[in-house]
């Protein structure tokens, strides 16, 4: 008689899951040797230790703190690049400049980007049709407390002038529920950051509006002045333009602004 | 069986760009970060640069930053190096290779090698 | 750079001889030393890794030791096939650097 099977509205654990992680734990340490003590098989146990056999909507951060140990990592801590909405500009962004650092640079983060997973209450089977929502099901699920997790202690971490980058394009530059605006902008420590700097990349070629100004951004300053940590903001125009001008800062054109 | 099977040889001018392909079989090709190496006609073995073809990072070594170009297509499985500016020391059998499971982090895994001949 | 010094460059033994060839890291490089067998024409083909671990399928004349700075390969038993120039590699920073090379000869 076929088992039933709980249906979540979010989609199934990523395809090669298992494989994925492990290799991915290969490939990091190969191309970051300061990490060759990490034993990827004991990562790949940790991990899959924090979701297996548990109700995928009662996980906690708790669970995630034997693969946390195991991935426990040093990064400068005034070289942490944080971003919302705009993934893939900050990672290309720490592409080139290779002394900064995302959370999807660090081993934890690495291992899991893009990636989804749950499994199912007192199985050890992967869920591969459905894993909850964070809307429609329930927030404490195993990718959603990952990422807080790994979320706040990079965070946590931080030190001296901490930068952001926002997406200028959504209606929403600073949005309060997404995981900078939940947890990162929270656990950012006043007695080691001086200031964060918000870097607003602006989405159309003629925009040229000073989206530092946008209340969302104004709320966003309120809450870190609160926190007795100092903000500042630049546009960033022309991201293009910027990135161009990392690659090759004494290019003539990149004096002007960006 | 993993295999690397890199493109034949080519015969270039100075100055010229050339580009190199290494398609691989035998495993999941964003699973492994593939490396290029360099060897100079009679000459040791010199590292060049690696990919990692799933995220489409790089790292080139110092000597061949801001003329070697390494890309990855996920859909071919099939890593390229491009090296530009091309000058007669450039003459040289290229490789890609990659790491296993079981070998630490040296390189069981190599092409058979593209013969690049720079000549005027 | 880490600069990896092999001696000798080249050496010539009998067959059944005992041949030894050391490469010097210009610093700690701990145990991640790769030792390579390359054949005219071919790719080079992984011998040791990891100082003094043989690689699957790999004859038993073939063994690695050191740590550190300091490392040593041999083949116990010189037969005509090991005819070949052989590399050590650092794989412990980037970027890998390889020694020059020893090329082996049968007397």
């Known amino acids: 008689v076929p088992r039933w099977r709980q249906q979540w509205s979010g989609p199934g654990t990523t395809k090669r899951f298992p494989e994925t992680v492990l290799a991915r734990c290969v490939k990091y340490t190969e191309i970051h040797p300061e990490m060759r003590h990490v034993d990827c098989q004991s990562v790949w146990d940790a991990f899959k230790g924090a979701f297996i056999s548990k109700h995928p909507c009662n996980i906690t951060e708790e669970d995630y703190q034997p693969l946390m140990k195991l991935g426990t990592q040093t990064v400068p801590c005034n070289k942490i690049l944080l971003w919302s909405r705009i993934k893939d500009l900050a990672h290309q962004f720490t592409q080139v400049q290779r002394d900064m650092f995302t959370l999807e640079d660090t081993l934890l983060g690495y291992l899991a980007d893009d990636l989804t997973w749950c499994g199912e209450f007192n199985t050890s089977k992967i869920n591969y049709q459905s894993c909850p929502d964070w809307r429609k099901d329930c927030s404490n699920n195993p990718v959603s407390v990952f990422w807080k997790t790994v979320s706040r202690r990079f965070a946590e971490a931080a030190c001296d002038v901490v930068h952001v980058m926002l997406n200028g394009s959504r209606s929403k530059i600073f949005d309060k529920n997404s995981t900078f605006g939940s947890v990162e902008v929270h656990n950012l420590q006043p007695e080691k950051v001086q200031t964060l700097e918000a870097w607003v990349i602006h989405g159309g070629r003629e925009d040229s509006r000073d989206l530092c100004q946008d209340p969302t951004i104004k709320e966003l300053e309120s809450i870190i002045s609160k926190r007795n940590i100092q903000f500042s903001c630049k546009n960033i125009y022309r991201p293009d333009k910027f990135l161009q001008c990392v690659k090759n800062p004494e290019d003539s054109s990149c004096t002007s602004e960006i | 069986e993993v295999q690397l099977v890199q493109s034949g040889a080519e015969v270039k001018k100075p100055g010229a760009t050339v580009k190199i392909s290494c398609k691989v079989s035998?495993?999941?090709?964003?699973?492994?970060?593939m490396n290029w190496v360099q060897q100079g006609p009679g000459k040791g073995l010199e590292w060049m640069g690696w990919i990692d073809p799933e995220y489409g990072r790089t790292d080139v070594a110092e000597k061949f930053q801001g003329r070697v170009t390494i890309t990855a297509d996920t859909s071919t499985d099939t890593a390229y190096m491009e090296l530009s500016s091309l000058r007669s020391e450039d003459t040289a059998v290229y490789y890609c290779?990659?790491?296993?499971?079981?070998?630490?982090?040296?390189?069981?895994?190599w092409g058979q090698g593209t013969t690049v001949t720079v000549s005027s | 750079d880490i600069q990896m010094t092999q001696s000798p460059s080249s050496l010539s033994a009998s067959v059944g001889d005992r041949v030894t060839i050391t490469c010097k890291a210009s610093?700690?490089?701990?145990?991640?030393v790769d030792w390579y067998q390359q054949k005219p024409g071919k790719a080079p083909k992984l011998l040791i890794y990891?100082?003094?671990n043989r690689y699957t399928g790999v004859p038993s004349r073939f063994s690695g030791s050191g740590s550190g700075t300091d490392f040593t390969f041999t083949i116990s038993s010189l037969q005509p096939e090991d005819i070949a120039t052989y590399y050590c590699?650092?794989?412990?920073?980037?970027?890998?650097?390889f020694g020059g090379g020893t090329k082996v000869e049968i007397k």
């Open positions: 035998g495993y999941t090709f964003t699973d492994s970060v």
């Open positions: 990891k100082a003094s």
């Open positions: 590699m650092q794989s412990n920073t980037h970027p890998r650097t």
């Open positions: 610093q700690n490089v701990d145990s991640d």
């Open positions: 290779a990659r790491t296993g499971y079981n070998s630490g982090y040296g390189f069981p895994y």
